[in-house]
């Protein structure tokens, strides 16, 4: 037994403990986040292939038939048996591919029938021998260590025909003879040997499901007999090598064992955990327990499969136990498909490589592990742009790194699978697993590096993951007039103040006649007190929450439909206006200044008064005039107290609603822009001189990054996303008075090619003058960064006009609604705004994340800390005039994603204290930080407000 870093003994057989470890770890716990670190020095980086998958030349130069050659001919509908990457012919091209990657080893398998056509060791096939000698010598010349697999499923057909294949014990000796020859012939150049690749699949699919060669099925006893013979064959070869070759060749030998991974339905259920353990031992344990464990099959199997599972004698147990110099492990798609043949035990299949490595550590006493196969697959139509493969690899590799660095698992090497596209067993040529793309129909079978090859090369070059995404955190503060805000969506006004107390001038006597009623006392009139803002229950609640938040600003939206139910000034809801005035005045008493949004579209009815909605909403240009009238009313009623106005929240997201055709989307956007501009000019001319406020609109502004940094079309798509999503509104307002040239040209080009019939509206000269410059600051709502790829789409929809597709980076910390936490995205966005629209004041008017926690919302705290830190870098390093940060949002809504600092029933979460601290510190001051801002200075608008009160 080995000791781990904590000096605790790991006793074999304790794999089930994996599912009980830290079930309630926070998602932001360092052990759960992507790990930026390096692999151990001299980590063994490799790549692998299987002979049958890549060699081709199936009957060339005297090669014998294999079970897979026969299986293809009889069971699989494959057009050409030689459609592989033809490595037998194009060895030099394989070597160049290996050079490109910079690997330390190449794992390949020897084709038994290429060396010995009928399977028996007589005279080796000279041409086959020459090929493997050339391969080995060429590798050593390049300082690439060969890792050689003796058997990767291509059994000589002669042995299948004559003996029934691995069902027959005769194969044990025949395999040993073949191995002996290989040790004698190649052993001087090979330090790592693998006897058999994934015996589980040979037995299970070869003799159980019939999905693999030789394609036998239905005989359960045969499956376990085959497994038994494979174990004995391996064991015999190990002892042979150990006795006769290791002393002078000084190599290591193992067997590659493959497995899936499984998670319990309920983490706390002992029954489910036992089922998971059973699932693992019946696949991986079937072969690992005899070799790496106690020499026998797992107890679960011996009990359950009594009649079909062969028994080991005590001598055989001793013989098989310990016959591996390291644990060679395969984790890839072949152990996961087809799903219906898996031992799932009703639990959940998972791709968590870190967990399965921990299971091996606990179950088998922390052996040294070589990951002998790892990777995923792409569809056959994918050529060099295998973006999802990058993310699968990134995820797997980081899980390995976490297992090594955080869990003390002794992984010493990693084999990316596969070097080349080739024959993928029961999938034939319908999937690809190569790091290099091969066109099987081309004469020369060129090996073209895929994005995943570039990525793997980079990881090898850096021996891991170096933090390439951040400037070190700063200590520093925001300016003293910085707005620390919280955002709320639409505040629905209370129709009646909740307290009628003192509004009735009469005096009453209760129960004077015993009838338990009130009797008015005639002739007496009392002084009433006027209605007070605190009569509104919701305002009281609001104020309590805001006071706890310690914010300097509160951003909320008015409900247009409540203020003007008819959509015009013929019917003004004075009570609603009074309610909103109360929200503002009461806030100001607490030194909390308002930022008021006039129009906050909601999906249900777009937040429009019903008559406007029915007359076409934003597709009707007259809605802009109605909006002007409504805005004017609000400026008159509230403008003396409100210094920051937002006309429309996220007009660039209305496409979600006006999505019948792209032309609806673009027309609605056009009318919204004009409506905003009309209101800005109205404020500028009539209200600014006396009210001295500022006005803008808030744009949804998520950042975009190319999903695949190695492909130009991806960063072009990311650029296009920014143009279609943000510049669409920002360009007319903050720069040219027209839509972005790039957007206009892209849509026109698609329309010319018949891929769309979209038309971006034109601004008249008057409209251009109206729109250009119609904003006093840049307001943006930023939540996340999207990973973007190019995908050509047809049809006249705004979403398809962009030719953009999104990819979820599985390695990123994400929220329940899959919002990725990528703090540096906000800094890049702010820099983009400055570059494109100049040195103007910028407010982040909403920024936040959904977090499942009802109380201890650690994800939200992490998000706030990291995003505000990036905003500080933008201010201090990039000289961006950031004026405020408004966290989203005050309260969450029932059955909606949990974005709130308070629950829907007003319970406070712990992120409030964290945000308090940020506000009080005005950022991240150093211990002996510079001068703190005094409170009044931090709230310049409020001095005026207090005078007004």
């Amino acid at each position: 037994d080995y000791k781990d870093d904590d000096d605790k003994l790991d006793f074999p057989g304790d794999g089930r403990a994996v599912w009980s470890q830290n079930p309630n770890l926070s998602p932001v716990n360092e052990s759960q986040l992507f790990l930026y670190d390096t692999f151990p020095k001299n980590f063994f980086w490799g790549v692998g292939t299987g002979a049958f998958q890549v060699e081709g030349s199936w009957k060339k130069d005297g090669k014998g038939l294999s079970v897979w050659d026969h299986f293809i001919a009889t069971h699989l509908n494959v057009s050409s048996r030689d459609g592989s990457s033809d490595s037998y012919i194009f060895l030099e091209k394989d070597l160049s591919a290996l050079d490109f990657l910079g690997v330390s080893f190449y794992q390949f398998s020897i084709s038994w029938p290429r060396l010995f056509p009928d399977g028996t060791v007589a005279v080796a096939n000279a041409k086959g021998l020459q090929y493997y000698n050339r391969l080995l010598d060429s590798l050593l010349l390049r300082n690439i260590e060969p890792v050689v697999t003796l058997y990767h499923w291509d059994l000589p057909w002669a042995l299948q025909e004559k003996y029934g294949g691995w069902k027959n014990e005769t194969l044990i000796d025949l395999f040993n003879d073949y191995a002996t020859y290989c040790f004698q012939t190649f052993g001087d150049r090979v330090k790592y040997w693998i006897t058999i690749h994934n015996p589980y699949l040979v037995a299970w699919h070869g003799y159980g499901t019939g999905l693999h060669a030789p394609g036998e099925k239905g005989n359960v006893a045969a499956v376990y007999t085959v497994g038994h013979n494979l174990l004995k064959a391996h064991s015999k070869v190990w002892h042979n090598y150990n006795r006769n070759f290791r002393p002078h060749q000084k190599g290591w030998l193992s067997i590659t064992l493959g497995s899936h991974w499984i998670e319990p339905n309920r983490a706390e259920s002992i029954v489910d955990i036992l089922k998971c353990q059973q699932s693992m031992v019946s696949v991986l344990g079937w072969f690992a327990n005899p070799i790496h464990g106690d020499g026998d099959y797992p107890e679960v199997m011996t009990k359950k499969l009594l009649s079909v599972l062969p028994a080991f004698s005590e001598a055989e147990k001793n013989e098989v136990r310990g016959t591996a110099d390291f644990f060679a492990f395969s984790f890839g798609p072949n152990n996961f498909k087809p799903l219906n043949t898996m031992a799932k035990m009703g639990q959940n299949v998972s791709l968590n490589l870190r967990q399965v490595l921990n299971w091996i550590k606990l179950e088998y006493g922390n052996p040294r592990i070589l990951i002998a196969e790892n990777g995923w697959f792409t569809d056959s139509y994918v050529q060099t742009e295998d973006t999802t493969a990058i993310y699968m690899m990134k995820n797997f590799l980081n899980q390995v790194l976490q297992a090594i660095r955080l869990d003390g698992v002794r992984v010493f090497g990693y084999t990316a699978w596969s070097l080349l596209d080739g024959f993928e067993w029961q999938d034939a040529y319908n999937t690809r697993r190569g790091l290099f793309y091969v066109d099987f129909n081309s004469e020369q079978r060129e090996r073209r590096p895929k994005s995943s090859a570039h990525y793997y090369k980079q990881v090898i070059g850096e021996n891991g993951f170096t933090l390439r995404e951040a400037t070190p955190d700063l200590q520093g503060q925001f300016p003293c007039d910085f707005s620390w805000g919280v955002t709320e969506s639409v505040l629905k006004p209370e129709s009646v103040a909740s307290s009628p107390q003192f509004s009735d001038p009469h005096l009453y006597v209760w129960n004077a006649t015993g009838n338990r009623m009130l009797h008015r006392v005639e002739g007496v009139r009392l002084k009433t007190r006027p209605a007070q803002c605190t009569d509104f229950i919701t305002i009281k609640k609001q104020l309590e929450m805001l006071a706890r938040m310690k914010v300097t600003h509160f951003r909320f939206a008015l409900d247009w439909a409540s203020v003007l139910p008819t959509g015009n000034l013929s019917e003004v809801n004075r009570q609603a206006l009074r309610y909103y005035r109360c929200v503002v005045t009461e806030g100001l008493k607490l030194n909390i200044s308002p930022m008021v949004t006039l129009y906050y579209p909601t999906h249900a009815h777009l937040g429009l008064p019903a008559p406007l909605l029915h007359s076409g909403g934003w597709l009707d240009p007259s809605t802009a005039k109605a909006f002007r009238d409504y805005a004017g009313l609000c400026f008159r009623e509230l403008g003396d107290l409100v210094k920051l106005w937002i006309t429309i929240n996220e007009p660039n997201r209305l496409s979600d609603v006006y999505n019948r055709t792209s032309n609806d989307t673009y027309q609605a956007a056009h009318n919204l822009l004009i409506a905003h501009a009309i209101v800005w000019h109205l404020y500028d001319r009539q209200y600014r001189p006396s009210q001295r406020g500022a006005l803008s609109l808030s744009l949804h502004s998520d950042w975009a990054e190319p999903a695949n940094p190695y492909v130009a079309s991806h960063w072009q798509a990311a650029e296009r996303f920014l143009q279609f999503e943000i510049a669409w509104f920002a360009e007319p307002l903050f720069k040219t008075g027209d839509y972005p040239v790039a957007m206009r040209e892209y849509i026109a080009s698609k329309t010319r090619r018949g891929l769309s019939s979209s038309v971006l509206p034109r601004f008249s000269d008057a409209e251009r003058r109206l729109v250009k410059g119609a904003a006093d600051f840049y307001a943006l709502n930023h939540f996340t960064t999207r990973f973007v790829m190019h995908e050509q789409q047809n049809g006249s929809r705004y979403d398809s006009d962009r030719d953009v597709q999104f990819l979820q980076d599985i390695t990123r910390l994400s929220s329940p609604t899959r919002l990725a936490v990528i703090p540096w995205g906000v800094r890049k966005l702010l820099r983009w705004v400055r570059r494109n629209y100049g040195d103007m004041d910028i407010y982040i008017t909403a920024s936040g994340i959904d977090d499942q926690a009802l109380q201890n919302d650690q994800l939200r705290q992490y998000y706030l800390e990291k995003y505000v830190q990036e905003a500080l870098k933008a201010y201090l390093i990039d000289k961006i005039k950031i004026k405020g940060y408004y966290a989203f949002k005050l309260t969450e809504e029932k059955s909606k994603p949990r974005f709130g600092f308070f629950t829907s029933d007003f319970k406070a979460k712990s992120s409030i204290q964290f945000y308090n601290k940020l506000i009080t510190s005005n950022g991240f001051p150093s211990e002996n930080g510079g001068p703190r801002c005094n409170q009044t200075q931090g709230n310049p608008e409020c001095t005026v407000c207090l005078l007004l009160l």
Partner: antibody, heavy 120, light 111 residues
Framework: QVQLKQSGPGLVQPSQSLSVACTVS????????VHWVRQSPGKGLEWLGV???????DYNAAFISRLTISKDNSKSQVFFKMNSLQTTDTAIYYC??????????????WGQGTSVTVSS | DIVLTQSPTSLAVSLGQRATISCRAS??????????MTWYQQKPGQPPKLLIY???NLQSGIPARFSGSGSRTDFTLTIDPVEADDVATYYC?????????FGGGTKVEIK
Amino acid sequence: QVQLKQSGPGLVQPSQSLSVACTVSDFSLTTYGVHWVRQSPGKGLEWLGVIWSGGSTDYNAAFISRLTISKDNSKSQVFFKMNSLQTTDTAIYYCARDYGSTYVDAIDYWGQGTSVTVSS
Amino acid sequence: DIVLTQSPTSLAVSLGQRATISCRASESVESYGNRYMTWYQQKPGQPPKLLIYRAANLQSGIPARFSGSGSRTDFTLTIDPVEADDVATYYCQQSNEDPWTFGGGTKVEIK
């Protein structure tokens, strides 16, 4: 095709200022930024500063106190002004177009250069 | 400021052979997954010409015999095969951090 044409004096007295205009054609200054780079035998290529499409500027800290870059979008002109020149400022001064993509920070087209000698 | 050191300072190559120019940065010029390294070619009496951006992307109109590679602090420009028209000085430039800086140049001649 994309062009950047520079005009400016060849000779400047020490302690005087240098003004160079760069007139661009076939692209808009509201879409592309314009950089200024100089090249001298002693110091090789030196990046001086940039004016971005939105009008904001970034300067090399070594020149920030004596450099101003401005532009007139409607006239497709960018203006470069450097004060207090010394003999060490003798160089070829280039205006050059930014690649124009958020994800590529590079210069893709250069003016022909203005050869400036600082001498009394 | 980030210092870029090019090597060799001059290079004589036979026609049809490969030329490799190295550029080493005093600190990483990679951030946010982008490699902010650019290569230019300058012929006598002419302004520089863009060859490669983002370390490995070929500018349109530039022949495929030019290629770029590298990450973090070590970058390489390769010309393979070298042609007579490639006689020039080659500069690397980083834009990861202000001020943008250039390497000292590598002069390529034909043997």
